[in-house]
């Protein structure tokens, strides 16, 4: 869907340089506006902290597949 | 500018097949899961099936499993949805769209960027 006229962008600047424990991370949210200089990843942490990551990265990538299938419904 | 486009709608017998496929541009595609949704007149926009950045995850509606299969080639950009003995009740608009938000697979809200969609239509 377009995104709201002037909305407010959250753009991610610098990636974190370690890998974060899964059992940290509560969601992930993507940046993939325009107006941001990269593509990101912004994980949520259990505290609320939010943390920009580098989603090329493997780690990250198993990451978000983690907190997706801990949300999937299981269908028998 | 993410784009996704859709192509390999059209007008099937039951029982018979169609491959959809879905073309991303404006993004790095290799890291995206993507998903399929349908949607037929006057209902709701429904999820169809998923698949994961890698592709080594798919998730399916009950009502396509073991029919449609979901699959991806990162290195062209592009997802598919291959479609075997299609019902009526399979008549819809098929789109995908990029999922952004962690959470469900099939949860709509989860996803942005959809394509206009291609038609599928399935006879008696």
């Known amino acids: 869907q377009p995104d709201a006229i002037n909305a407010p962008v959250t753009c991610c600047y610098n990636f974190t340089n370690r890998k974060i424990s899964v059992q940290r991370l509560a969601s992930y949210r993507r940046i993939t506006s325009s107006k941001c200089p990269k593509e990101a990843v912004i994980f949520k942490t259990i505290v609320a902290k939010e943390i920009c990551a580098d989603p090329k990265q493997k780690w990250v990538q198993d990451s978000m597949d983690h907190l997706d299938k801990q949300t999937q419904t299981p269908k028998t | 500018e993410v784009q996704l486009v859709e192509s390999g709608g059209g007008l099937v017998q039951a029982g018979g097949s169609l491959r959809l496929s879905c073309a991303a541009s404006?993004?790095?595609?290799?890291?995206?899961?993507m998903g399929w949704f349908r949607q037929a007149p006057g209902k709701e926009r429904e999820f169809v099936a998923a698949?994961?950045?890698?592709?080594?995850?798919?998730y399916y509606a009950d009502s396509v499993k073991g029919r449609f299969t979901i699959s991806r080639d990162n290195a062209v950009n592009t997802i598919y949805l291959q479609m075997n003995s299609l019902k009526p009740e399979d008549t819809a608009v098929y789109s995908c769209?990029?999922?952004?938000?962690?959470?469900?697979?099939?949860?709509?809200?989860?996803?942005?960027?959809w394509g206009q969609g291609t038609q599928v239509t399935v006879s008696s």
């Open positions: 769209a990029v999922k952004i938000y962690s959470g469900s697979y099939s949860s709509p809200p989860g996803y942005n960027h």
């Open positions: 404006g993004l790095t595609f290799s890291t995206y899961p």
């Open positions: 698949i994961n950045s890698g592709g080594s995850y798919t």
